[in-house]
């Protein structure tokens, strides 16, 4: 069963001091990661017992394995059902506590009733404040039965439930007619899925014979031990004030477990701690009684004395529950109540015995759950005991269950049952996850879900280059931390697999499925520098750069140009996808802006060092384009251009710029300044005869403006080859006079 305890502090003078604590003794409980177990949950269950709304309750986590609920403001907040959920996966378990109001009309004689399938359960509600009306019994909040108030027997109303079955389990309550449901007596009925002493799917298996009020779990045959007892059969008492499956927890406060109710996984239910009884667990056991709720009687023999926490304390020479066994009778010594081995291992199990006559090797045997008897392979004889060693054949899952060590001598016999848990080594169900990669390292999350049993003690990461036959490299990592695989080859695929281990010999599981993880390219190392830049317009910038000369091939796929506009806090990135490029035209920039410019080489997704930055000021935006540009050939070497001034000028034009290009030519265009801004005509001279030219122009104020439309015109025929175009400008009217 899951090691989960719900404690209720029943010192009820002040509801604000009331608290519920859920404690888990499970490994890794409450850590909250899906792979290693969900957190503990503690809440009030309002589905059956509804209380008036109040301020929300406060939940406080104390480490990973304890959670406490506080913040109760009035007594009615306490009434009802509380539950704690803990454990992971198939072991997820709900522990339930039912709280009754001490001032209720009716009070339960006993809150938790655990019965076997087919038994008769009797719930008894004691009259605390009489009311001469019917009594309504409810099951899980719905009407179940009714009694006339005259039917009370000895001041109690009884509900008899014959031949109970597991579906009868639940919360029962007894309430007077016309009385608040918060004044009900609340009960919890737990019906085991099997008859007395049986467990398993068809109830075919025999329970181990739980001692000290332990209850046999109908699913796994384990004893759920009362608080204060431990061992496979609950045969061992904890020290006073301790609880938990291994007595590992301690009751809070100076008065130990006084005033605390303990609720454990079904089919146990709730009780006071060992040595205490009463509705508020504040009364010590009467002489001769011990254990949880003081339900057990000592009946010590041979001078034994009764301890209310542990039962009979035997004088020298005697042992047994009632000190009924003489130390001359052989006795199994210090046998662990539970052993854990991994599947397919061949463990050695030791069993020690003492007695008079002294046990020898042949008098000690080991019996498996299937009835197979193993004889010891060797024995170590010491003055006070004989220890027999058994070599167990390769374990299979069916070996899980109760084993028994038995010693027989002429003085009598003794046997001790112990639980063997055969655990399946964990196997990852998924491949590890790649978190980040670099050229020579991969960062991997090894945390994966797994089949088989935890806890995970170690995680091994195996890796090697893809399609390689070389040995796997292995790294052992902490299960909860990411791992960095280092000193890898760049741009290489690696096969990566996880292997999980649980504690103990043979705890290594099979390797999980592989996954392919590829390292990044090598980082580019060369640092370019900016050769220069040229403003080609208010929003255009031509940039050129160089790289240092190094031997070998260039490591890079291209260049990244970055322009930082500090005023607006904006970055512009331009990708040049050829590693051979050394120049780029940046367009669509913001006129009149101060940019910081740099360039860096990239390879795959990695960037090399950036060039030292340059600072570039783009001129402000220029005027609109000149209108109605027209070209007219005057001779075999002259063409006249006419235009109209741009509209809506932001200021006086300083000059015009004419662009001349041979149509279909591959060469760079020629720019000619017209320095008299009042002109609306100019003659371009020195052109080649019978040649088709393209013209466009723009005005300049503080910066160059937009281009006009492009016009075409051909010079007249067969003149001599000119040296190159020049211009002469006049007022338009003069040009026409010529």
């Amino acid at each position: 069963a899951v090691d989960l305890t719900l404690l209720a502090n029943l010192r009820l003078t002040d509801p604000q001091r009331f608290f519920l604590t859920c404690v888990s003794g499970e490994a890794g409980a409450g850590r909250g990661s899906d792979a290693w177990g969900p957190p503990l949950l503690l809440e009030k269950d309002d589905r059956i017992v509804r209380t008036p709304p109040g301020p929300p309750l406060r939940l406080a986590r104390n480490g990973s394995h304890q959670v406490t609920l506080r913040g109760f403001s009035k007594p009615s907040d306490l009434v009802g059902v509380f539950s704690c959920v803990g454990g992971a996966g198939a072991r997820r378990t709900r522990v339930i506590y039912v709280h009754n109001s001490p001032g209720a009309h009716l009070l339960p004689d006993k809150v938790t009733h655990t019965v076997n399938k087919g038994d008769t359960a009797v719930l008894s509600a004691r009259v605390h404040k009489e009311k001469q009306t019917d009594v309504i019994w409810k099951s899980n909040g719905s009407y179940f039965y009714t009694l006339d108030w005259h039917e009370a027997q000895d001041g109690r109303f009884l509900l008899q439930l014959p031949n109970v079955q597991p579906p009868s389990s639940g919360i029962y309550s007894a309430t007077y007619l016309e009385a608040s449901p918060l004044g009900s007596a609340f009960f919890r009925l737990i019906v085991r899925g099997c008859g007395a002493g049986r467990w398993g799917p068809g109830c075919t298996k025999e329970c181990p014979g739980c001692l000290h009020g332990g209850v046999c779990h109908d699913h796994d045959g384990e004893c759920v031990c009362p608080p204060g007892f431990t061992g496979t059969r609950c045969e061992q008492a904890c020290r006073e004030g301790r609880f938990g499956q291994s007595c590992q927890e301690q009751c809070p406060g100076i008065s130990g477990c006084r005033g605390l109710t303990f609720c454990l996984p079904d089919p146990y239910g709730c009780s006071c701690g060992s040595g205490w009884r009463g509705s508020q667990c504040q009364e010590a056991c009467a002489p001769g009684h011990f254990g949880a709720d003081c339900r057990l009687q000592c009946q010590c023999q041979n001078g034994g004395t009764c301890d209310r926490f542990s039962g009979c304390v035997c004088p020298s020479g005697w042992h047994g529950v009632h000190c009924e066994k003489s130390d001359r009778i052989p006795q199994i010594l210090n046998m662990a109540s539970e052993l854990e081995f991994n599947l397919e291992t061949m463990p050695r199990i030791n069993c020690a015995a003492a007695g008079n006559p002294f046990p020898v090797r042949g008098s000690i045997e080991l019996r498996k759950p299937d009835g197979t008897v193993l004889l010891s392979t060797k024995a170590i004889v010491e003055p006070e005991k004989t220890t027999a060693e058994f070599e167990v054949p390769r374990l299979v899952l069916a070996d899980s269950g109760f084993w028994e060590c038995r010693v027989s001598t002429s003085g009598g016999q003794d046997s001790r049952r112990f639980k063997v848990n055969v655990k399946v080594p964990p196997v990852p169900l998924a491949a590890p996850r790649l978190l980040t990669k670099q050229s020579r390292q991969l960062v991997v999350s090894p945390l994966v879900s797994f089949s088989g049993d935890g806890p995970i003690s170690t995680v091994r990461l195996h890796y090697r280059p893809q399609d390689s036959t070389m040995d796997w490299s292995t790294i052992v990592v902490d299960p909860s931390e990411n791992v960095t695989l280092m000193n890898l080859r760049p741009k290489t695929g690696y096969s990566v697999r996880v292997q999980l281990s649980r504690p103990g010999e043979g705890g290594e599981g099979a390797w999980g499925p592989p996954t392919l993880m590829t390292t990044d390219c090598p980082e580019p190392l060369l640092q370019p520098w900016l050769e220069g830049w040229h403003v080609e317009g208010t929003d255009r910038l031509r940039v050129s750069w160089s790289l240092p000369l190094v031997p070998g091939p260039l490591v890079g796929d291209g260049f990244l140009l970055r322009l930082w506009d500090g005023t607006r806090g904006q970055e512009r990135r331009e990708n040049v996808s050829s590693p051979q490029a050394r120049t780029a035209l940046l367009t669509g920039l913001t006129p009149g802006t101060h940019y910081q410019l740099d360039v860096q080489l990239y390879h795959c997704t990695l960037l090399g060092p950036a060039s030292p930055p340059a600072h570039v000021l783009l001129p402000p935006s220029g005027p609109p384009a000149p209108r109605h540009l027209h070209a007219q050939a005057l001779s075999d070497s002259e063409i006249q251009l006419t235009w109209k001034h741009p509209e809506a000028l932001p200021g006086p034009i300083s000059k015009y710029v004419v662009e001349v290009q041979v149509a279909g030519g591959a060469g760079d265009p020629l720019w000619i300044d017209v320095d008299r801004p009042e002109e609306t005509s100019t003659i371009i001279r020195g052109l080649n005869a019978s040649t088709r030219y393209l013209f466009r122009m723009r005005a300049s104020i503080q910066g160059l403006g937009d281009w006009s439309n492009t016009v075409e015109e051909s010079t007249l025929g067969n003149g001599l080859q000119a040296e190159g175009p020049v211009q002469e400008s006049r007022a338009a009217e003069e040009g026409l006079d010529q």
Epitope: Y145, T146, L147, T175, E178
Partner: antibody
Framework: EVQLLESGGGLVQPGGSLRLSCAAS????????MSWVRQAPGKGLEWVSG????????TYADSVKGRFTISRDNSKNTLYLQMNSLRAEDTAVYYC????????????????????WGQGTLVTVSS | DIQMTQSPSSLSASVGDGVTITCRAS??????LNWYQQKPGKAPKVLIY???SLQSGVPSRFSGSGSGTDFTLTISSLQPEDFATYYC?????????FGQGTKVEIK
């Protein structure tokens, strides 16, 4: 579907006895209170007797106290009314009835109406 | 025992009329009053419980009110199937007692 079927009615002389039965089906008979209600020809309804699920608690109208006995057999899902020292004024249709409880929004339970009735059986007391 | 007095003992009305029947208890019964409808040769059928709560499946033209000793059953608009005898009953204490009945006839 809840069904209540009365039987055992008939003609009986004054001072005589009769035992009425009511066979219940369609609900868990052993969990509910049951009652007998009668109606004299052309007259109103009169509650006669009631019994709790265990059979331990019984109540009677003053007019029948000491003469009539209500009982039940939960294993047979049957309600009985043993009528002794019958009088002419006991002539009536006898209904087997199941009263209910109801609860309010706060969860308080109250004794409610008779929500299921049989079809009735006629008892005639006459010489 | 608690006496229940119903009035009127009979009334004539037409389809569509509104009808009110009253019931008085000889002592306070809080709201533990139920109303039944009975047609000739049939068993009674519960209409209203707890003085004003409409039983499931009963048309909303039926309504109840009152508390303590005085209670009322109202049929807001009589339908042909509503012509029957109506009884009040207290479930406050045993013996449970019924009113003598009110017969609603067609005018």
């Amino acid at each position: 579907e809840v069904q209540l079927l009365e039987s055992g009615g008939g003609l009986v002389q004054p001072g005589g006895s009769l035992r009425l039965s009511c066979a219940a089906s369609g609900f868990t008979f052993s969990k509910y209170r049951m009652s007998w209600v009668r109606q004299a020809p052309g007259k109103g309804l009169e509650w006669v007797s009631g019994i709790y699920p265990s059979g331990g608690g019984t109540t009677y109208a003053d007019s029948v106290k000491g003469r009539f006995t209500i009982s039940r057999d939960n294993s047979k899902n049957t309600l009985y009314l043993q009528m002794n020292s019958l009088r002419a004024e006991d002539t009536a249709v006898y209904y087997c009835a199941r009263p209910t409880y109801y609860y309010d929004s706060s969860g308080y339970y109250y004794s409610g109406p008779i929500d299921y009735w049989g079809q009735g059986t006629l008892v005639t007391v006459s010489s | 025992d608690i006496q229940m007095t119903q009035s009127p003992s009979s009334l004539s009305a037409s389809v569509g009329d509104g009808v009110t029947i009253t019931c008085r208890a000889s002592q306070s019964i809080n709201n533990h009053l139920n109303w039944y409808q009975q047609k000739p040769g049939k068993a009674p059928k519960v209409l209203i419980y707890a003085a004003s709560s409409l039983q499931s499946g009963v048309p909303s033209r039926f309504s109840g009110s009152g508390s303590g000793t005085d209670f009322t059953l109202t049929i807001s608009s009589l339908q042909p199937e509503d012509f029957a005898t109506y009884y009040c009953q207290q479930s406050y204490s045993t013996p449970w007692t019924f009113g003598q009945g009110t017969k609603v006839e067609i005018k």
